[in-house]
Interface confidence: medium
């Protein structure tokens, strides 16, 4: 019995659902009563899911697996794995027995995008040319381990005096901290890039250091210049810092976070204590770090509706404020491709190819091309509909006149994550079975 699985690993984002494809070719007269289907972990032989005696025997794997019962009779033995975790990574074997027996293994590669790096300087004031500065680049909650690169303002790689550490949390996701020690020139830009080798996702940030004394007077409040990019459902840190003077105590501090446009209160710290969240109970400060000048805000379980500008107001004796932008994002699913009509196709027929990708944010850019890599822009209609969470489902329709045969590819690009998801269909102008 020939059992077919994809050659390439299935790549799944942490927290999403993954389909481990497996198929067989049922003979005429096949009934599910004849089918024994077992999914197990290839290495440990641990049972994951099974179908026997004409019935789905259910999940033996943390109740997170399911078959496609309506498709089994057509030979689709695929397994749905829900809420993927890092610990799920590995090889799964699909065993199919009817009269004959066959098996094949499919690999699951788990991935999670890294957050946009935050950059910190130590020391961060009274800097002069010749001073040695430690620049820390931190990026969070990615998988697998990242590749980290540094470079200067001229694009020159910096490899000396770099120390990078990667620590896995209890979910197996990595936090990356890379430290660069540099001797300051008159001024300089230093950039760090954190690359996810599986997703080919790059996250980078820069810091420009101008060694000079900051003017006395107003409190200098520092926030990142670039928007903070946060994935829907994850936590985001809106960084804000000030430089406390010697003898500073929290009793002197008034800190207010508010929505820049509407002035709606988000969180505050006054009279020496945290006054708590005024924003759906999803915000928190870093109380242990306030005395060092860290006024950052943690926003939990980010939603599309959170996107926008947040202002950090700091008042001690003097007063200062700065606004930080939150850019919300969600990766698009791998597109599914459908054909209409999908059989008895001949050269000269007009075919409608639909490319659908789901639950992304913000709106996607959609591109089509043929098998020669030539962009297809005519006869394309793309619609994007937001669901109740504000996430977009994309449907792009291409109308083509068939040649002898042809490949048509659609790419759905998330412009914020620079995440590309693509699907292809190859049409042979002859009766299709």
């Amino acid at each position: 019995l020939e059992v077919q699985v994809p050659e390439d690993p299935v790549v799944a984002l942490v927290g999403t659902d993954a389909t481990l494809c497996c198929s067989f070719s049922p003979e005429p007269g096949f009934s599910l009563a004849q089918l024994n289907l077992i999914w197990q972990l290839t290495d440990t032989k641990q049972l994951v899911h099974s179908f026997a005696e004409g019935q789905d025997q259910g999940s033996a794997y943390a109740n997170r697996t399911a078959l496609f019962p309506d498709l089994l009779a057509q030979g689709n033995a695929s397994l749905r794995l829900q809420r993927v975790r890092v610990a799920d990574e590995g090889s799964f074997t699909c065993f199919v027995s009817i009269r004959d027996f066959g098996s094949a293994a499919v690999s699951l590669q788990v991935a999670a995008p890294y957050s946009k790096p935050s950059m910190t300087l130590e020391p961060n004031k009274d800097l002069r040319p010749g001073d040695t500065v430690t620049i820390t680049c931190s990026s969070y909650q990615g998988y697998p381990e990242a590749e980290v690169f540094w470079q200067d303002g001229q694009g020159v790689p910096l490899t000396g005096n770099v120390t990078t550490s990667q620590m896995a949390n209890e979910q197996g996701l990595f936090d990356v901290h890379s430290i660069l020690r540099v001797v300051l020139g008159a001024n300089g830009t230093y950039s760090c890039l954190v690359r996810n080798p599986v997703l080919q996702q790059d996250a980078h940030s820069s810091v420009t250091i101008t060694p000079q004394r900051s003017p006395t007077g107003a409190v200098e409040v520092q926030v990142p210049e670039d928007p903070v990019v946060a994935l829907v459902g994850t936590d985001a840190t809106l960084r804000c810092s000030f430089s406390p003077e010697p003898g500073f105590s929290l009793a002197q501090l008034n800190l207010i976070w508010q929505l820049t446009d509407t002035k709606q209160l988000v969180h505050s710290f006054t009279e020496g204590r945290d006054q708590g969240s005024a924003y759906a109970n999803r915000t928190a400060l870093f109380p242990d770090l306030l005395a060092q000048g860290n006024a950052s805000l943690r926003l939990q379980r980010v939603r599309v509706a959170d996107e926008g500008s947040f202002t950090c107001f700091v008042s001690i004796r003097d007063f200062g404020s700065a606004a930080v932008s939150l850019q919300v994002a969600a990766p698009y699913s791998k597109p599914s491709m459908t054909l209409e009509p999908n059989k008895d196709l001949r050269p000269g027929d007009t075919v409608t190819i639909t490319c659908s990708s789901y639950r992304g944010y913000p709106e996607a850019e959609v591109f089509w091309q043929d098998g020669q890599g030539v962009p297809l822009t005519g006869n394309v209609t793309t619609s994007q509909m937001a669901n109740e969470q504000g996430l977009f489902d994309v449907h792009s329709v291409l109308r083509v006149v068939l040649g002898a045969n042809g490949t048509y590819s659609c790419l759905v690009r998330n412009p914020v994550l620079q995440q590309d998801a693509h699907g292809s269909v190859t049409i042979t102008g002859q009766p299709m079975t």
Partner: antibody, heavy 121, light 106 residues
Framework: EVQLVQSGAEVKKPGASVKVSCKAS????????MHWVRQAPGQGLEWMGG????????TYNQKFKGRVTMTRDTSISTAYMELSRLRSEDTAVYYC??????????????WGQGTTVTVSS | DIQLTQSPSSLSASVGDRVTMTCSAS?????MHWYQQKPGKAPKLLIY???KLASGVPSRFSGSGSGTDFTLTISSLQPEDFATYYC?????????FGGGTKVEIK
């Protein structure tokens, strides 16, 4: 179409200086770092250095430090490479080459056609 | 400086042959890039970041490797592929090129 068009061939005497230009078109000049690479007759490629047209910052191969100067004129989207105190072993084809756009692209995606510099007494 | 050693320095092959050339770095690099140069012409980017095909480059070209050992493969040599191929790194300054592999007609 993205193009880098270089100035014409030069013949110089030992000890003189040469200044080669590279005019960019088809893209935003200040968004890409420009580098210079040379190739002696029958030899391989040798990196000389680069300039960030946005703020004029430069990086040079130590081998050429003190002899090479890279400048740019953003108003005419042109980069320049000047090599001084020429000697016969500087006879080569000099190429300008554009570094990939993403900040961490450490390769050259577009090249000029080359300028032949001959140093001979 | 990181030295890049290309081997072989030259090779003879026929149209349709599978051709492989290597680039060995004196110390570990993050990525290798490959260029093709024809006589009297400027180099042309073929492969970047070790394995990514540059725009407009035919899929018969592929790159692989990591650490200190990298490979460029032409799966089925075409008449227009007879040229010199250079590897390049910039994981550490200065940027360096390999000495080249010349692919000639057998």
């Amino acid at each position: 179409e993205v193009q880098l068009v270089q100035s014409g061939a030069e013949v110089k005497k030992p000890g003189a200086s040469v200044k080669v230009s590279c005019k960019a078109s088809g893209y935003t000049f200040t968004e890409y770092i420009m580098h210079w690479v040379r190739q002696a007759p029958g030899q391989g490629l040798e990196w000389m250095g680069g300039i960030n047209p946005n703020q004029g910052g430069t990086t040079y191969n130590q081998k050429f430090k003190g002899r090479v100067t890279m400048t740019r004129d953003t108003s005419i989207s042109t980069a320049y490479m000047e090599l001084s105190r020429l000697r016969s072993e500087d006879t080569a084809v000099y190429y300008c080459a554009r570094k990939g756009k993403d900040y961490f692209d450490w390769y050259f995606d577009v090249w000029g056609q080359g300028t032949t510099v001959t140093v001979s007494s | 400086d990181i030295q890049l050693t290309q081997s072989p320095s030259s090779l003879s092959a026929s149209v349709g042959d599978r051709v492989t050339m290597t680039c060995s770095a004196s110390s570990s690099v993050s990525y290798m890039h490959w260029y093709q140069q024809k006589p009297g012409k400027a180099p042309k980017l073929l492969i970047y970041d070790t394995s990514k095909l540059a725009s407009g480059v035919p899929s018969r070209f592929s790159g692989s490797g990591s650490g200190t050992d990298f490979t460029l493969t032409i799966s089925s040599l075409q008449p227009e592929d007879f040229a010199t191929y250079y590897c390049q790194q910039w994981s550490a300054s200065p940027l360096t090129f390999g000495g080249g592999t010349k692919v000639e007609i057998k």
